[in-house]
């Protein structure tokens, strides 16, 4: 018999979960690094593709499930997956924060005009990461 269809999470639910796991946190998943994603289209699939490789991290399991549901929501969703920046790795928490920025913008205004926020955040993260290693 066919399995019951789980309703896709709403943007609101995704925002709640992302705030829940990032609030007052300096790190997630023991500082695991993941591939950065270019947040131009297919955001949920791209984020899922990057986060799916993180194992043994209960903190992001619900987020992974939500992204999986959102990614498979439309037939073409899997085909418009954003490119991953194969040359840039960032911490899980930074990817999650970037996703939160994106989703908040989509929530507020359908077409999100604040993508620069994410690119800026990635630049800051990259700078801080390399600066940190330079001094240690």
């Amino acid at each position: 018999s066919p399995s019951p269809v789980t309703p896709s999470p709403t943007l609101k639910e995704l925002i709640e979960e992302l705030v829940n796991i990032t609030q007052n946190q300096a790190s997630l998943c023991n500082g695991s690094m993941v591939w950065s994603v270019n947040l131009t289209a297919g955001m949920y699939c791209a984020a899922l593709e990057s986060l799916i490789n993180v194992s043994d991290c209960s903190a992001i399991q619900r987020t992974q499930r939500m992204l999986k549901a959102l990614c498979s929501q439309k037939p073409a969703a899997g085909q418009i997956s954003s490119e991953r920046s194969r040359d840039t790795k960032i911490e899980v928490i930074q990817l999650v924060k970037n996703l939160l920025t994106y989703v908040r913008g989509v929530y507020r205004h359908g077409n999100f005009r604040g993508l620069n926020d994410i690119f800026e955040a990635q630049k800051i993260e990259w700078h801080e990461h390399h600066h940190h290693h330079h001094h240690h």
């Epitope: 709403t10 925002i15 908040r104 507020r108 926020d117």
Partner: antibody, heavy 118, light 111 residues
Framework: EVQLVESGGDLVKPGGSLRLSCAAS????????MSWVRQAPGKGLQWVAT????????YYSDAVKGRFTISRDNAKNTLYLEMNRLRAEDTAVYYC???????????WGLGTLVTVSS | QAVLNQPASVSGSLGQRVTISCSGS????????VGWYQQLPGTRPKTLIY???FRPSGVPDRFFGSRSGSTATLTISGLQAEDEADYYC???????????FGGGTHLTVLG
């Protein structure tokens, strides 16, 4: 402890300009969308403007669109409101607020009074 | 700009329970994060509830937020004299791309 401290409120003539500042501390400023909310004497709360956490997404109420500009300096943990072509109806206490969820405020500043009068 | 609809005033006796409603539409309360704020005379607003139901630390559990469809409700149980204040609700409206506030409700606590 989260603190939001506004400054820059003053008495200004109609048509004049003013810049409000809000110094934020006690939280990771770059993680949160921030807004300005105002309250005219004896009236209710009215939203003015919102900026996304990085500053490139901005939203304005119809009452101030084209006259006010919200911005932030994440390096200085400071939120700004540039107010031009001020009118008598802009007279209010202006509050700087932190949004934990979109349009859901968890902290309020002390407020700064802007009086527009000739 | 449209506002969310709140009763102008409500009253209740000490120790009683009162509810304050905030009604909107499917484009705001129906899908948004609702906040509730208390403003005592001459002071800045204070957040009682954010994200529909969450209470910031320090806010007593006498204050309870809920939402059903396009109406949000703030319930205050065990009324105390210091609860006499103005109460406002807020949420985002996605069709207006605007943060909306209710017009405010004045709560009177009867001795």
């Amino acid at each position: 402890e989260v603190q939001l401290v506004e400054s820059g409120g003053d008495l200004v003539k109609p048509g004049g300009s003013l810049r409000l500042s809000c110094a934020a501390s006690g939280f990771t400023f770059t993680d949160y969308d921030m807004s300005w909310v105002r309250q005219a004497p004896g009236k209710g709360l009215q939203w003015v403007a919102t900026t996304s956490n990085g500053g490139s997404g901005t939203y304005y109420s119809d009452a101030v669109k084209g006259r006010f500009t919200i911005s932030r300096d994440n390096a200085k943990n400071t939120l700004y409101l540039e107010m031009n072509r001020l009118r008598a109806e802009d007279t209010a206490v202006y509050y700087c607020v932190k949004e934990i969820y979109p349009a859901s405020i968890d902290f309020w500043g002390l407020g700064t009074l802007v009086t527009v009068s000739s | 700009q449209a506002v969310l609809n709140q009763p102008a005033s409500v009253s209740g006796s000490l120790g009683q329970r009162v509810t304050i409603s905030c009604s909107g539409s499917s484009s705001n309360i129906g899908r948004g994060f609702v906040g509730w704020y208390q403003q005592l005379p001459g002071t800045r607003p204070k957040t009682l509830i954010y994200g529909d139901t969450f209470r910031p630390s320090g806010v007593p559990d006498r204050f309870f937020g809920s939402r059903s469809g396009s109406t949000a409700t703030l319930t205050i149980s065990g009324l105390q004299a210091e609860d006499e204040a103005d109460y406002y609700c807020s949420t985002w409206d996605d069709s207006l791309a605007a943060l909306l506030f209710g017009g405010g409700t004045h709560l009177t606590v009867l001795g």
